[in-house]
């Protein structure tokens, strides 16, 4: 079976304050079984932004229908962006288990926030 790759095509994304940011992430294989999670930052203190299996995440929506078994697009949209949302976002595949374990990470997308146009 094909080795899973996690593709975050955008190294950086710039969004005006108040707008929505779309962070793209696609995977190349359905295996191993397990959820995709989005985090802001790396290391122990990273913050959970989206998890298929828990929620709600009021400002985050998925771009495609992630509940479909064959779905490989795990892009997210974050609404009403503020300067506090700036940072690097990682799309990460977990292997199903008790607990789920991290399998592979995307390279990250840096979100920068522009001042609201007057």
């Amino acid at each position: 079976e094909e080795e899973l790759q996690i593709i975050q095509p955008d190294k950086s994304v710039s969004v005006a304050a108040g707008e929505s940011a779309i962070l793209h992430c696609t995977i190349t294989s359905l295996f191993p079984v397990g959820p995709i999670q989005w985090f802001r930052g790396a290391g122990p203190a990273r913050v959970l932004i989206y998890n298929q299996r828990q929620g709600p995440f009021p400002r985050v929506t998925t771009v495609s229908e992630t509940t479909k078994r064959e779905n490989m697009d795990f892009s997210i949209s974050i609404s009403n962006i503020t300067p506090a949302d700036a940072g690097t976002y990682y799309c990460i595949k977990f292997r199903k288990g008790s607990p789920d374990t991290e399998f592979k990470s995307g390279a990250g997308t840096e979100l920068s926030v522009r001042a609201k146009p007057s």
Epitope: F39, G41, A42, G43, P44, A45, R46, V47, L48
Partner: antibody, heavy 117, light 108 residues
Framework: DVQLVESGGGLVRPGESLRLSCAAS????????VTWVRQAPGEGLEWVSL???????YYADSVKGRFTISRDNSKSTLYLQMNGLRAEDTAVYYC???????????WGLGTLVTVSS | EIVLTQSPGTLSVSPGERATFSCRAS??????LAWYQQKPGQAPRLLIY???TRATGIPARFSGSRSGTEFTLTISSLQSEDFAVYYC??????????FGGGTKVEIK
């Protein structure tokens, strides 16, 4: 408003155990790493332990093998199980919320642990 | 482990004056340095992170700067509520997260 409330401190003898709790509210507990920091009487701050969003744990060398950090996301509560307590563990223990920048933006008021024979 | 050395240990300043104190890291931490304020009987409060970014709600009289491994916190005009102990903390990506020994700012 973010609130962190520690409990479980008290007076124990050397070698005994104690479990501290920290009840969190005002933020989505499951989404953040949380940490314990202590302060011995009249001394500075010392980082003790951290638990990540995914449950990975980290410890200061001074407590490794004796202390265990854990979290119950369903109760929005952080714990610190302290075994084999020593006199040098006497301190006020604070829990704090950790930002993605690895800084501690909200702190509890602390709970005092005294280890003395 | 990164060691942070704060100086001076105590700083005596009159209200309205400028206060400047420093924190030196034993090895490079980039700009990953934070400052906290602690008043007697209270928990620490985050003031500055990334060497010079003020935390939410922190007044503009607090500012931070960096020169290599030396970091400075400046309070431009001391208010009565600013007399406290100030700690630096390195916040590189991985533990242990170390703190400096603190600088006490007292009324002259």
């Amino acid at each position: 408003d973010v609130q962190l409330v520690e409990s479980g401190g008290g007076l124990v003898r050397p070698g005994e155990s104690l479990r501290l709790s920290c009840a969190a509210s005002g933020f989505t507990f499951t989404n953040y790493a949380v940490t314990w920091v202590r302060q011995a009487p009249g001394e500075g701050l010392e980082w003790v332990s951290l638990i990540s969003v995914t449950g990975t744990t980290y410890y200061a060398d001074s407590v490794k093998g004796r202390f265990t950090i854990s979290r119950d996301n369903s109760k929005s509560t952080l714990y610190l199980q302290m075994n084999g307590l020593r006199a040098e563990d006497t301190a006020v223990y604070y829990c704090a919320k950790v930002t993605w920048k690895n800084v501690f933006d909200y702190w509890g008021l602390g709970t005092l642990v005294t280890v003395s024979s | 482990e990164i060691v942070l050395t704060q100086s001076p240990g105590t700083l005596s300043v009159s209200p309205g004056e400028r206060a400047t104190f420093s924190c030196r890291a034993s090895q490079t931490v980039g700009s990953k340095l934070a400052w906290y304020q602690q008043k007697p009987g209270q928990a620490p409060r985050l003031l500055i992170y990334d060497a010079n970014t003020r935390a939410t709600g922190i007044p503009a009289r607090f500012s931070g700067s960096r020169s290599g491994t030396e970091f400075t916190l400046t309070i431009s005009s001391l208010q009565s509520e600013d007399f406290a102990v100030y700690y630096c903390q390195q916040h590189t990506d991985w533990p242990p997260y170390t703190f400096g020994g603190g600088t006490k700012v007292e009324i002259k």
